[in-house]
């Protein structure tokens, strides 16, 4: 659900942290229509996720912790 590097909607799937290598934040006030977390997966896919959803926050927290501990 992305176009010109902007997410236009959100995935309706839940991803496991083991599938994700990193993420990018998309902000609505920076040229895109919606706030989103763009997850980058091990299969080189970019997945647009809703930053308000619990599972998304959980993975962002996990990945942020990992980066901090590096």
């Amino acid at each position: 659900a992305s176009n010109f590097d902007c997410c236009l909607g959100y995935t309706d799937r839940i991803l496991h942290p083991k599938f994700i290598v990193g993420f990018t934040r998309q902000l609505a006030n920076e040229g895109c229509d919606i706030n989103a977390i763009i997850f980058h997966t091990k299969k080189k896919l970019s997945v647009c996720a809703n930053p308000k959803q619990t599972w998304v926050k959980y993975i962002v927290r996990l990945l942020s912790k990992k980066v901090k501990n590096m």
Epitope: L15, H16, K18
Partner: antibody, heavy 120, light 107 residues
Framework: QVQLQQPGAELVKPGASVKMSCKAS????????MHWVKQRPGQGLEWIGV????????TYNQKFKGKATLTVDTSSSTAYMQLSSLTSEDSAVYYC?????????????WGQGTSVTVSS | DIQMTQSPASLSASVGETVTITCGAS??????LNWYQRKQGKSPQLLIY???NLADGMSSRFSGSGSGRQYSLKISSLHPDDVATYYC?????????FGGGTKLEIK
């Protein structure tokens, strides 16, 4: 201790709907997902869908979209699944099960299951 | 959707033996795999999570291994109490999918 209480059985007529409950106790209801799983007699397990009680976010197995509707009542720590337009294919045991993303997204506690029989 | 294939579908072994159940995924699931035990007339119980971690309260005779697309569950020194159906489950991405199950009986 963690408990998920489900009614034992439901007998319903073809074409009707049924709404089954799953009352959670022994943990903070909004901190864990609630999954629903189907098991037909002599067959394997099928994942129906999941609801996040903290915000009522749901996602379904495509096969059960339009068939199952998941809801929660956080005031009573109860999850519900409604099944509509019932046929004999819907006769099965339905389990609610707690989803724990802290334990590798596993379903770490299961209800006893509600046996649904669709018969005229 | 990711397909999970379990083998064998059924298995008969003697008390004290070691048995192995395998589970194959249609694509790499990166260790996002759980195992459940369902005894006759009971609800399923979590047995192994994250491919290798033993769930609380389960016997250390159970062990999980594997990576990528291939996983296995080993039961050592088989007990009569181990009679059950065992299921693997993919949790990499929804819809979560289960293997068809392996029914374990005692000879």
């Amino acid at each position: 201790q963690v408990q998920l209480q489900q009614p034992g059985a439901e007998l319903v007529k073809p074409g009707a709907s049924v709404k089954m409950s799953c009352k959670a106790s022994g943990y903070t209801f909004t901190n864990y997902w609630m999954h629903w799983v189907k098991q037909r007699p002599g067959q394997g397990l099928e994942w129906i869908g999941v609801i996040d009680p903290s915000d009522s976010y749901t996602t379904y197995n495509q096969k059960f979209k339009g068939k199952a509707t998941l809801t929660v009542d956080t005031s009573s720590s109860t999850a519900y699944m409604q099944l509509s337009s019932l046929t004999s294919e819907d006769s099965a045991v339905y389990y609610c099960t707690r989803g724990n993303y802290g334990v590798d997204y596993a379903m770490d506690y299961w209800g006893q299951g509600t046996s649904v029989t669709v018969s005229s | 959707d990711i397909q999970m294939t379990q083998s064998p579908a059924s298995l008969s072994a003697s008390v004290g033996e070691t048995v192995t159940i395998t589970c194959g995924a249609s694509e790499n699931i990166y260790g996002a795999l759980n195992w459940y035990q369902r005894k006759q007339g009971k609800s399923p119980q979590l047995l192994i999570y994250g491919a290798t971690n033993l769930a609380d309260g389960m016997s250390s005779r159970f062990s999980g291994s594997g990576s990528g697309r291939q996983y296995s569950l080993k039961i050592s020194s088989l007990h009569p109490d181990d009679v059950a159906t065992y299921y693997c489950q993919n949790v990499l991405i929804t819809p979560y999918t289960f293997g068809g199950g392996t029914k374990l009986e005692i000879k």
